[in-house]
C-alpha cells in the first residue's frame, strides 16, 4: 500500500519519486497523474516530462524542483488545498513493453493546527514535516505503526509546538496510517 | 465533434486474414492512445489491444498475442488491426475506441464473422 | 487477471425511481473503474471513470462510488432512454477487463 504524506492547506506539499537514469544522463519520460498508477499511462496528467524536459502541466502549481536531470522526479505541489488530497502516480516510463516503474504515493492534507505557535517557531508543515515522515528521497527511512508513534514527547527543533505534534499525531493514529520517520 | 468510422469487417474462413481500420476526426489524434474493444454476438465487452501515443508500444490480450497487430498512422489519422490466423471464437463486433484505460468515445463497429 | 462481478443481472426498476447497480473486483482496482452504458445495437458510452468521475455530457442523475474491490452505480431518477446494459471496467490490473453486465428493463 501506499506511504503517507503529509501537507497544510496552504502550504507546499513535497511527493518523493526517483530512478537512476542508466546510463547518466539517459533521462525516460515520465508522468504524474491525480489516482492510483492504472495499467497504462497516467490518469488524470498533473505533469509529463520527456527525455529533456517538463513538457505538460496542467497547473503553474506543479513543479519538479529536484535534480530532473539525475532522476529526481518528486513532485512539488504549491500552495495545496483539500482538494489536493489523494493518490497520485509517479509513472517512470522505461521503454519496452511493461517495463514502467509505477510508485502510487498518497497526500494528506490537513487543515491549519488552530493554535498559534511562538513568531520563532517554523510553521512550514509541508516542506519540513513531510520529509520528516517519510524521507522518500534520501535512502530508506525507519517505518513505525501507529502504534508505535511517540505521544507528546516528539522533540522537534525549532518546528513545531507540542500540541500541534500531540495533534497531528493523534490523527495519524486515528486514520491507521504507517509513518515513516527520519 | 470527435468521431471514429470503424471499416474492414466481414465473413472471413477460419485461418483467414481480415484488416480493420477506424478512421478519427475532431481531436489530436496523435496526442492520444486508441484501442480496439470486441463483443462478441450476445455476450460482454472484451479489451482487445492498445497503441501508445506514437505507435512506440502495443499491447494485446494474450488470447490474440501473435496473430493479431495493432497499427496507427498519424498522418492518415487512422489506427489498424491486422487480424490473422483468425479461430472461430475471434467472431465478434470489434470496436475502434480513444483512450488506454478507459475509453470515450467510440466507433459504431464492424462486425468479423468467422465461419467455414 | 481481475474478474469483474456485476449484480444483479437483470434489474427491473420503474421509471422514475432509483437504481442501483454493483460490480465486484476479485483484487483491489482502487478507484481505476468505469461505468459504460450500451443500448440495444449501439456502441458503449463511458458514463463513469475513476468510479466516480462523471464523463462529459453525462446526466447528473449518474453517479458512482466505491474504491477497492466493491463499487455501485446509482441512477437516481430513471428515464425512458437509462433502460439498457451497463458495464463495469477495471483498468488498474493487467489485462483490462469488463464485467458480464447488468441489464437494466422497465418494471
Known amino acids: 500500500s501506499e506511504v503517507e504524506y503529509i501537507a497544510e492547506v496552504g502550504q507546499n506539499a513535497y511527493l518523493p519519486c526517483s530512478y537512476t537514469p542508466a546510463p547518466p544522463g539517459n533521462l525516460v519520460p515520465v508522468c504524474w497523474g491525480k489516482g492510483a498508477c492504472p495499467v497504462f499511462d497516467c490518469s488524470n496528467v498533473v505533469l509529463r516530462t520527456d527525455n529533456r524536459d517538463v513538457n505538460d502541466r496542467t497547473s503553474g502549481r506543479y513543479w519538479l524542483k529536484g535534480d530532473f536531470h539525475k532522476g529526481d522526479v518528486s513532485l512539488t505541489i504549491e500552495n495545496v488545498t483539500l482538494a489536493d488530497s489523494g493518490v497520485y502516480c509517479c509513472r517512470i516510463q522505461i521503454p519496452g513493453i511493461m517495463n514502467d516503474e509505477k510508485h502510487n504515493v498518497k497526500l494528506v492534507v490537513i487543515k491549519p493546527a488552530k493554535v498559534t505557535p511562538a513568531p520563532t517557531l517554523q510553521r512550514d508543515l509541508t516542506s519540513a514535516f513531510p520529509r520528516m515522515l517519510t524521507t522518500g528521497e534520501h535512502g530508506p527511512a525507519e517505518t513505525q505503526t501507529p502504534g508505535s508513534l511517540p505521544d507528546v514527547n516528539l522533540t522537534v527543533s525549532n518546528f513545531f509546538c507540542e500540541l500541534q505534534i500531540f495533534t497531528l499525531t493523534n490523527e495519524l493514529r486515528d486514520s491507521g496510517a504507517t509513518i515513516r520517520t527520519a | 465533434e470527435v468521431q471514429l468510422v470503424e471499416s474492414g469487417g466481414g465473413l472471413v474462413q477460419p485461418g483467414g486474414s481480415l484488416r480493420l481500420s477506424c478512421a478519427a476526426s475532431?481531436?489530436?489524434?496523435?496526442?492520444?492512445?486508441m484501442s480496439w474493444v470486441r463483443q462478441a454476438p450476445g455476450k460482454g465487452l472484451e479489451w482487445v489491444a492498445n497503441?501508445?501515443?506514437?505507435?512506440?508500444?502495443?499491447y494485446y490480450v494474450d488470447s490474440v498475442k501473435g496473430r493479431f497487430t495493432i497499427s496507427g498512422d498519424n498522418a492518415k489519422n487512422s489506427v489498424y488491426l491486422q487480424m490473422n490466423s483468425l479461430r472461430a471464437e475471434d467472431t465478434a463486433v470489434y470496436y475502434c475506441?480513444?483512450?488506454?484505460?478507459?475509453?470515450?468515445?467510440w466507433g459504431q463497429g464492424t462486425l468479423v464473422t468467422v465461419s467455414s | 487477471e481481475t474478474v469483474m462481478t456485476q449484480s444483479p443481472a437483470i434489474l427491473s426498476v420503474s421509471p422514475g425511481e432509483r437504481a442501483t447497480l454493483s460490480c465486484r473486483a476479485s483484487?483491489?482496482?482502487?478507484?481505476?473503474l468505469a461505468w459504460y452504458q450500451q443500448k440495444l445495437g449501439q456502441a458503449p458510452r463511458l458514463l463513469i471513470y475513476?468510479?466516480?468521475t462523471r464523463a462529459t455530457g453525462i446526466p447528473a442523475r449518474f453517479s458512482g462510488s466505491g474504491s477497492g474491490t466493491e463499487f455501485t452505480l446509482t441512477i437516481s431518477s430513471l428515464q425512458s432512454e437509462d433502460f439498457a446494459v451497463y458495464y463495469c471496467?477495471?483498468?488498474?490490473?493487467?489485462?483490462?477487463?469488463f464485467g458480464q453486465g447488468t441489464r437494466l428493463e422497465i418494471k
Open positions: 497503441i501508445k501515443r506514437g505507435g512506440s508500444e502495443r
Open positions: 483484487q483491489s482496482v482502487y478507484s481505476n
Open positions: 475513476d468510479a466516480s
Open positions: 475506441a480513444r483512450g488506454s484505460n478507459w475509453f470515450d468515445p
Open positions: 471496467q477495471q483498468y488498474n490490473n493487467w489485462p483490462i477487463t
Open positions: 475532431g481531436f489530436t489524434f496523435s496526442s492520444y492512445w
